[in-house]
Amino acid sequence: VSPTFQVVNSIAPVQECSTQLDIVIVLDGSNSIYPWDSVTAFLNDLLKRMDIGPKQTQVGIVQYGENVTHEFNLNKYSSTEEVLVAAKKIVQRGGRQTMTALGIDTARKEAFTEARGARRGVKKVMVIVTDGESHDNHRLKKVIQDCEDENIQRFSIAILGSYNRGNLSTEKFVEEIKSIASEPTEKHFFNVSDELALVTIVKTLGERIFALEA
């Protein structure tokens, strides 16, 4: 205010504008993910750290395997509590193939649209969780470039469980999932030994996501 108590060009509180993120979580729900409860536990731990609301952080969830399903849109729920209840109810949809490029592309093209609740000028964040090399990895270069063009920040998580259970080399898989993550890779890529270990990265992942708000 001015000395005469007139309102002059006011600036919104830093905290209010800095808590706005549109986050879409892209979940691999193909048959090899096991146990699914570990995924929902991870979601629960991650989401409860978020201040969710129409003027704060919004969260949408997409699940993919062979095909892609919008579990819920960014603007579907207006509180953390509502989102937690909805996330707990997400069932594993299965699928013999892991179409990660399709999952990411669908999130970019559809989940981040205004029709599904995305807000103009609000930072877009995608969190991709998968446990295996994609069958459509030959389409990833384009999909990632499209995300770059739209300034979508990507965090990728590689679950090594099925590889470790089968005593398989994780090298190609890790390389692929690293390629999905935004730069710098070391701040945007995570890998966990199995599905149960997902909860161990929640704190760091949450901190890194919310560091984007600044």
Partner: antibody, heavy 117, light 108 residues
Framework: QVQLQESGPGLVKPSQTLSLTCTVS??????????WSWIRQHPGKGLEWIGY???????YYNPSLKSRVTISVDTSKNQFSLKLSSVTAADTAVYYC?????????WGQGTTVTVSS | EIVLTQSPGTLSLSPGERATLSCRAS???????LVWYQQKPGQAPRLLLY???SRATGIPDRFSGSGSGTDFTLTISRLEPEDFAVYYC?????????FGGGTKVEIK
């Protein structure tokens, strides 16, 4: 709008290397939203995907031809190229280049390559 | 590799009739990765439909597509003289990208 044009010799001798170039006009090959493909069609037959390249140089080939195929890109010339080694009469076909986004939406007119001595 | 089988091989119809073309995959294909092309003699193929059912730019609405999993269909509601050609389905979700063998739509 974007147009593609194939060029290269129409006749190649058996055991030699077939070399074709596709020139892109009306748009930049460096726009990262497309793959740049090669497809061929044997006389009176269907279409066969040979492979494609991303502007960054990443390539993807049909396993049935992989040992003989090289696709490269020259962003400064807005061109991409196909080399197919050790050709035989079975490689006689019309060769097309195409832009691949969500399906191949722009094609060259095709160039006929005959393998014969 | 995913094998796409198109049927019938040839379809003999008159202008104004409805054409129904089938494309069957040897394993499940995401509809987002299924496309249809039209090819006329001496010409390059032309993209008709992507995502199994979305019309490409400039494609008239008499062309429509449907299907999921392993069975896909291209329908031309009323054949125009310029529609007599060969039609190919293609999948690009799995490498190698593969095409069907084609269906020739000819004038009866």
């Amino acid at each position: 709008q974007v147009q593609l044009q194939e060029s290269g010799p129409g006749l190649v001798k058996p055991s030699q290397t077939l070399s074709l170039t596709c020139t892109v006009s009306g748009g930049s090959i460096s726009r990262g939203n497309y793959y740049w493909s090669w497809i061929r069609q044997h006389p009176g037959k269907g279409l066969e995907w040979i492979g494609y390249i991303f502007y960054s140089g990443s390539t993807y080939y049909n396993p049935s031809l992989k040992s003989r195929v090289t696709i490269s890109v020259d962003t400064s010339k807005n061109q991409f190229s196909l080399k197919l080694s050790s050709v035989t009469a079975a490689d006689t076909a019309v060769y097309y280049c195409a832009r691949d986004g969500y399906g191949m939406d722009v094609w060259g007119q095709g160039t006929t390559v005959t393998v014969s001595s | 590799e995913i094998v796409l089988t198109q049927s019938p091989g040839t379809l003999s119809l008159s202008p104004g009739e409805r054409a129904t073309l089938s494309c069957r995959a040897s394993q499940s294909v995401s509809s987002s990765y299924l496309v249809w092309y039209q090819q006329k003699p001496g010409q390059a193929p032309r993209l008709l439909l992507y995502d199994a059912s979305s019309r490409a730019t400039g494609i008239p609405d008499r062309f429509s597509g449907s299907g999921s999993g392993t069975d896909f269909t291209l329908t031309i509601s009323r054949l125009e003289p310029e529609d007599f050609a060969v039609y190919y389905c293609q999948q690009y979700g799995n490498s190698p990208l593969t095409f069907g063998g084609g269906t020739k739509v000819e004038i009866k």
